[in-house]
């Protein structure tokens, strides 16, 4: 069951998945004056058995200009190498060794695909959230919504953060840090 | 655990260049907040520069900004240093860290909420 909204947005914070459950969908989108192959899915499906999950579909962008081209522009691995833009990298960033059965990692990136990555995410996803440049954290552990079916529609559950600038005094000074398990998932994770 | 071990450091002069590398083993490097530090000796050791694990936050002490780069490269476990226009005063050992709450929603400068550590490596500038 697909969620039917974004998950919530937090100023000054932005969101990224450790590990997307089956059934995710992530547009092939193209950067301005591309367009995605005549044959080319619209999509990237998580797909996946008991043992095993991955990303059913390629996406493939094409020169707008270039008409009845069928050249493959998924790039060689030599190629994605040099071609570690910081945008590239921010995509990248969770996609290490992180394996969650029924879970993709993050899709490496393709050539001339957007700057941005559209996911349409299924119920039980969680999200993670930081805070971004010259921001900190008044909730200072993990921060997290999970797409959870209620009453038959499904609502992603509150972030219990908020992000202020630097200079600002934190609300909570004597705050205690949770202390997470190091090498085990966030509980989140391992619950389902 | 993880574990960090740091390279790249060593003599250069006045105005010159290093790029110290962090390589880290365990697992799930990329929900850690990564961190560089720096000791005098004499001195405490200080923040440098740090990255989330969203890519989304690289604060810089003040003493660095606009000369040292931190990045990270997620597919090698490995956390670099890019340092330019160094100066007598980036003399020190440097340190990389990792720290211990994953998936945190900021990322800190206070060397206590780092839990992994490296050995560290020798900078030395001359002028």
């Known amino acids: 069951e697909l969620c039917d909204d974004d998950p919530p947005k937090i100023t000054h914070a932005t969101f990224k998945a450790v590990a997307y459950k089956e059934g995710t969908m992530l547009n092939c989108e193209c950067k301005r004056g591309f367009r995605r192959i005549k044959s080319g899915s619209p999509y990237m499906l998580c797909t996946g058995n008991s043992s095993h999950s991955s990303w059913d579909n390629q996406c493939q962008c094409t020169s707008s200009a270039a008409r009845n081209t069928t050249k493959q522009v998924t790039p060689q691995p030599e190629e994605q190498k040099e071609r570690k833009t910081t945008e590239m990298q921010s995509q990248m960033q969770l996609a290490d060794q992180v394996s969650l059965p029924g879970h993709c990692r993050e899709p490496p990136p393709w050539e001339n695909e957007a700057t941005e990555r559209i996911y349409h995410f299924v119920v039980g996803q969680t999200v993670y959230y930081q805070c971004v440049q010259g921001y900190r954290a008044l909730h200072r552990g993990p921060a997290e919504s999970v797409c959870k079916m209620t009453h038959g529609k499904t609502r992603w559950t509150q972030p219990q953060l908020i992000c202020t600038g630097e200079t600002e005094p934190s609300q909570f000074p004597g705050e205690e840090e949770p202390q997470a398990s190091p090498d085990g998932l966030p509980e989140s994770e391992t619950s389902r | 655990e993880v574990q960090l071990v740091e390279s790249g450091g060593g003599l250069v002069q006045a105005g010159g260049s290093l790029r110290l590398s962090c390589a880290a083993s365990g697992r799930a490097f990329s929900m850690y907040n990564m961190g560089w530090f720096r000791q005098a000796p004499g001195k405490e050791r200080e923040f440098v520069a740090a990255?989330?694990?969203?890519?989304?936050?690289?604060p810089y002490a003040d003493s660095v900004k606009g000369r040292f780069t931190i990045s990270r490269d997620n597919t090698q476990n490995t956390v670099y240093l890019q340092m330019n226009s160094l100066k007598p005063e980036d003399t020190a050992t440097y340190y990389c860290?990792?720290?211990?709450?994953?998936?945190?929603?900021?990322?800190?400068?206070?060397?206590?909420?780092?839990?992994?550590w490296g050995q560290g490596t020798q900078v030395t500038v001359s002028s």
């Open positions: 860290a990792a720290d211990s709450i994953r998936l945190r929603s900021d990322v800190t400068r206070i060397p206590l909420e780092y839990d992994y």
């Open positions: 990255t989330g694990w969203s890519g989304a936050n690289t």
